[in-house]
Interface confidence: low
C-alpha cells in the first residue's frame, strides 16, 4: 500500500509490513493479515465474507479498509447471496452429477464417474473398464465397443 | 506474464478453409476457458466460439455454427478455430482471449483473415 | 440474442475531463456487463468486469457503474494514454455481444 514515507520515525509500517522502496517512493509491503497505507487495518477479506464463489476485493472506504464482493455468475447482492434466475436453480444435474453455469440460461452438468450425458442421466458404459489388454472403450448406442490393440480381439479384447 | 499469440490468418477464396492457432504461455492453460472474437473491417467485436476447460464443452454464434470448430491442445498450450465453408463476411482481424471473472481478461494480438476471391 | 448499443460512437474531450461512455442493453443483464479498451494499434485490454470491478493494473480514474439495462464507463481525469476506443460487453446469454465502440478522441 502507498502511504508516507515509511522509513520516517511514526510513519513506519506496522503488524509486521515491510518498508520497500521502488521508483523513488516508499511503500509498506503488508503480509495477507492486513492492509492500508501503515498495514494498520485487518484485512477484511479473510473472513472470506462473499460467498457462493464471489471474489472479495479489498477497499478503501472514507480511509477504512473495506470489502466489496463480485458475484459469481447466478449470484447478485453485497455477499453474493441472491441467487438470480438461472439455468441450475432447478438442479439439472442428476446422479450427483455438479451443475457449472455458463451463462444464466446455460449449464454444463460435470457427471460422477459412471455416468454421462447433458445432465448425467446416462449410465457410461464404459465406466466398468471392460475392455482388457489396453483396448479403448467407446460408448456405442447403450453399450460400448472395443477397440483393440494388435494381436487380440473379441468383444472385449481377451 | 500472460501472452496470446495467434497465427494462421491469410487470404482465402471464398468456400475455402483456414486453420487459426492460439499459443498461450505464462498461465496454466487448462484451468481457463477460451473464447475466440472476431473484429470485422467496420470495427465491430463479434464472440465467435467458446470452449471450456477440457474442450468437452463448445458453444457457437448463430453466423459460424457448422462451418467453424473450436478445439484445444492442452499438452501442447494452444486454442485452435479450423473455419471451412468460408465467406466473404467472415473478414476479419480474429483475436483468441482467456475467460476470468466471467471475462475475457486477456486477448492476444489477433490474425488477419481476408475472404475474397 | 441481447443487443448493446453505445449510441455515441465517437468522442472528443479535453485532457484533465471527466468522460462518461454510455452503453445499454436490449434487456436487463444483471451487471453482466464488461468494458474493454482498443488503443488504436489494435490491443485490446479488459477494463472494467461486473459492471464495477476494476481489472489488475487499470488505473483507479476509471469507474463504471450501472444497473438494469443502462450502464456506464467513467474515466474522471483523461490522460493521452486513454485515447482509444471503449467497447461494452454483456455475458448473461449466450451468444455473448458487444456494443459497437465509442471512440474518444482529444479536443
Known amino acids: 500500500a502507498r502511504g508516507p514515507r515509511c522509513s520516517q520515525p511514526g510513519e513506519t509500517c506496522l503488524n509486521g509490513g515491510k518498508c520497500e522502496a521502488a521508483n523513488g517512493t516508499e511503500a509498506c509491503v503488508c503480509g495477507g493479515a492486513f492492509v492500508g497505507p501503515r498495514c494498520q487495518d485487518p484485512n477484511p477479506c479473510l473472513s472470506t465474507p462473499c460467498k457462493n464463489a464471489g471474489t472479495c476485493h479489498v477497499v478503501d472506504r472514507r480511509g477504512v479498509a473495506d470489502y466489496a464482493c463480485s458475484c459469481a455468475l447466478g449470484f447478485s447482492g453485497p455477499l453474493c447471496l441472491t441467487p438470480l434466475d438461472n439455468a441450475c436453480l432447478t438442479n439439472p444435474c442428476r446422479n450427483g452429477g455438479t451443475c457449472d453455469l455458463l451463462t444464466l440460461t446455460e449449464y454444463k452438468c460435470r457427471c460422477p464417474p459412471g455416468w454421462s450425458g447433458k445432465s448425467c442421466q446416462q449410465a457410461d458404459p464404459c465406466a466398468s473398464n471392460p475392455c482388457a489388454n489396453g483396448g479403448q472403450c467407446l460408448p456405442f448406442e447403450a453399450s460400448y465397443i472395443c477397440h483393440c490393440p494388435p494381436s487380440f480381439h473379441g468383444p472385449t479384447c481377451r | 506474464e500472460v501472452n496470446l499469440v495467434e497465427s494462421g490468418g491469410d487470404l482465402v477464396q471464398p468456400g475455402g478453409s483456414l486453420r487459426l492457432s492460439c499459443a498461450a504461455s505464462?498461465?496454466?492453460?487448462?484451468?481457463?476457458?477460451m473464447s475466440w472474437v472476431r473484429q470485422t473491417p467496420e470495427k465491430r467485436l463479434e464472440w465467435v466460439a467458446y470452449?471450456?476447460?477440457?474442450?468437452?464443452?463448445?458453444s457457437y454464434s448463430d453466423a459460424i455454427r457448422g462451418r467453424f470448430t473450436i478445439s484445444r491442445d492442452n499438452a501442447k498450450n494452444t486454442l485452435y478455430l479450423q473455419m471451412s465453408s468460408l465467406k466473404s463476411e467472415d473478414t476479419a482481424i480474429y483475436y483468441c482471449?482467456?475467460?476470468?471473472?466471467?471475462?475475457?481478461?486477456?486477448w492476444g494480438q489477433g490474425t488477419s483473415v481476408i475472404v475474397s476471391s | 440474442d441481447i443487443q448493446m448499443t453505445q449510441s455515441t460512437s465517437s468522442l472528443s474531450a479535453s485532457l484533465g475531463d471527466r468522460v462518461t461512455v454510455s452503453c445499454s442493453a436490449s434487456q436487463a443483464i444483471s451487471n453482466y456487463l464488461n468494458w474493454y479498451q482498443q488503443k488504436p494499434d489494435g490491443t485490446l485490454k479488459l477494463l472494467i468486469y461486473y459492471t464495477t470491478n476494476l481489472h489488475s493494473g487499470v488505473p483507479s480514474r476509471f469507474s463504471g457503474s450501472g444497473s438494469g439495462t443502462d450502464y456506464s464507463l467513467t474515466i474522471s481525469n483523461l490522460e493521452p494514454e486513454d485515447i482509444a476506443t471503449y467497447y461494452c460487453?454483456?455475458?448473461?446469454?449466450?451468444?455473448?455481444?458487444f456494443g459497437g465502440g465509442t471512440k474518444l478522441e482529444i479536443k
Open positions: 460487453q454483456q455475458y448473461s446469454k449466450f451468444p455473448w455481444t
Open positions: 482471449s482467456r475467460r476470468r471473472y466471467d471475462a475475457m481478461d486477456y
Open positions: 505464462g498461465f496454466t492453460f487448462s484451468s481457463y476457458t
Open positions: 470452449i471450456d476447460y477440457g474442450g468437452d464443452f463448445t
